[in-house]
């Protein structure tokens, strides 16, 4: 039961993650208009990953594309990029995770098919929070080397009254929304890893022992504990015996030192 | 038709407050913010305040801030212009408008006066 | 606050003549975000409200003659008049729409000459 509770709540976990991760690529507050410590303006600008806006205080709102490729930063591409390839990844292993589930039967699939593609939707997963946890974190930081920048020339001008305001942006919603869903998307590929673990069979029949019924005589292979990493066939370890009524998840558990004759 | 009209004006003595209203009809007045502006006798337009739309920000000139206080009622599309401790200076003709694309003021109504006398 | 200065305070013109009005602010009102300037020009007939002209400093408003034109960027900018007729007559104001507190020129003042 456990197994299960844990490889639903990595699912679920990553989906949220993964719609999260979707949902801050397509925002577009990326980054927003430092309000403080500037003049009140009566235009407040933001920008995203594949346009920039401008709301007026009048509710007027006008958004842009980004109509270039070779003319946006290297940095910003990087982020797509690295967003784009972090959704990829999410997708596939939300795709492959959804047959993996233990609670969805799909014909004959054994339980180590089963584990070996909760193994993989679970690196899939970590690996798309990776890359959305870093794309936010280098679009981060290129704010804060910006921001810093801006603020040392705020005010450039010709000398005398006439001033230029230079605009600096902070921190959007979207790197908040990114930071989170990237974690989130980690936190259930960490669990779909360990839910793998459990899901996997064990070459050890040390269950054959437990209830051995007089009269009759049982086969028992040896073989000491391997720790299956959910990839590899695991066909041959077919159950010889079992001797009591038992839920899937029981029949999954560790061998303890007791397990042993 | 967009329309705009204030009401509420007249004479005061200083001191004094006076509540400016303006009916707002022919936009959707919720999705709009609106402002006040102001002409003395015979001078140039003041911007007095501002109202955004949504979470209705509001913008003062620094000779009426703390004053001056404006609100929006949407389901009633109206403006208020609640003025208190009026002073001589603040006799003009009160314009209620609507602002645009640009922040620019593309719609005035007739304007309401008020003046401030002992 | 922003300075608006508009200059001249006042003209004499002939129908048919072409006009410039001056308008200096401050600071720039280029907003960076979407390279538009927030400046406003307003036309004024006596006993009458303002009526918006040009707004986004070059945008004419619909309805608004095509003989009316702004231009400039930045802190410089200059309404035009390419053809001054007698309905003309008013009173021109520059507008800061950039930044609070939303500042006007003192006007230019139009005249049949």
């Known amino acids: 039961m456990a197994v299960t509770a844990c490889q639903g709540l990595g699912f679920v976990v990553s989906l949220i993650g993964i719609a999260g991760i979707i949902a801050a690529t397509c925002m577009d507050q990326w980054s927003t208009q430092d309000l403080y410590n500037n003049p009140v303006t009566a235009v407040f600008n933001y920008q995203g990953l594949w346009r920039s806006c401008v709301r007026e205080s009048s509710g007027f709102t006008e958004c842009r594309g980004y109509f270039t490729l070779l003319g946006l930063p290297a940095m910003l591409q990087a982020v797509r990029a690295l967003m784009i390839v972090g959704i990829v990844l999410g997708a596939i292993g939300l795709l492959v995770s959804i047959f993996a589930l233990k609670c969805i039967r799909i014909g004959s699939m054994e339980d180590s098919a089963k584990a070996n593609m909760t193994l993989t939707s679970g690196i899939m997963f970590i690996v798309s929070g990776l890359c959305a946890i870093a794309g936010v974190s280098v679009f981060a930081n290129m704010l804060v080397t910006n921001f810093w920048m801006s603020t040392a020339n705020m005010y450039t001008g010709m000398g005398g009254m006439v001033q230029t305001v230079q605009t600096r942006y902070t921190f959007g919603a979207a790197l908040f929304v990114g930071w989170v869903a990237g974690g989130l998307t980690l936190i259930g590929g960490v669990m779909m890893c360990i839910a793998c673990r459990g899901l996997a069979p064990e070459e050890t029949n040390y269950k054959a022992v437990s209830y051995h019924a007089s009269g009759h005589s049982v086969a028992y292979k040896p073989g000491g504990f391997k720790a299956s990493t959910g990839f590899g066939s695991n066909t041959k370890n077919k159950k010889i015996y079992d001797g009591g009524a038992r839920t899937e998840d029981e029949v999954q558990s560790y061998p303890s030192k007791h397990d042993y004759v | 038709e967009v329309q705009l009209v204030e009401s509420g004006g007249g004479l005061v003595k200083p001191g004094g407050s006076l509540r400016l209203s303006c009916a707002a009809s022919g936009f959707t007045f919720s999705n709009s913010a609106v402002s006040w502006v102001r002409q003395a006798p015979g001078k140039g337009l003041e911007w007095v305040s501002t109202i955004t739309s949504g979470v209705s920000y509001t913008y003062y000139a620094d000779s009426v801030k703390g004053r001056f206080t404006i609100s929006r009622d949407n389901a009633k599309n109206s403006l208020y212009l609640q003025m208190n401790s009026l002073r001589a200076e603040d006799t003009a003709v009160y314009y209620c408008?609507?602002?645009?694309?640009?922040?620019?003021?593309?719609?005035w109504g007739q304007g309401t006066s008020v003046t401030v006398s002992s | 606050d922003i300075v608006m200065t508009q200059s001249p305070s006042s003209l004499s013109v002939s129908p048919g003549e072409r006009v410039t009005i001056s308008c200096k602010s401050s600071?720039?009102?280029?907003?960076?975000?979407?390279?538009?300037?927030?400046l406003t020009w307003y036309q004024q007939k006596p006993g009458q409200p303002p009526k918006l002209l040009i707004y986004?400093?070059?945008t004419r408003e619909s309805g608004v003659p095509d003989r009316f034109s702004g231009s400039g960027s930045g802190t410089d900018f200059t309404l035009t008049i390419s053809s001054f007729q007698a309905e003309d007559v008013a009173v021109y104001y520059c507008q800061n729409d950039y930044f609070y507190p939303l500042t006007f020129g003192a006007g230019t003042k139009l005249e049949l000459k």
């Open positions: 986004w400093a070059s």
């Open positions: 408008t609507r602002q645009f694309k640009g922040n620019a003021l593309d719609y």
């Open positions: 600071q720039s009102l280029l907003n960076s975000g979407n390279q538009k300037n927030y």
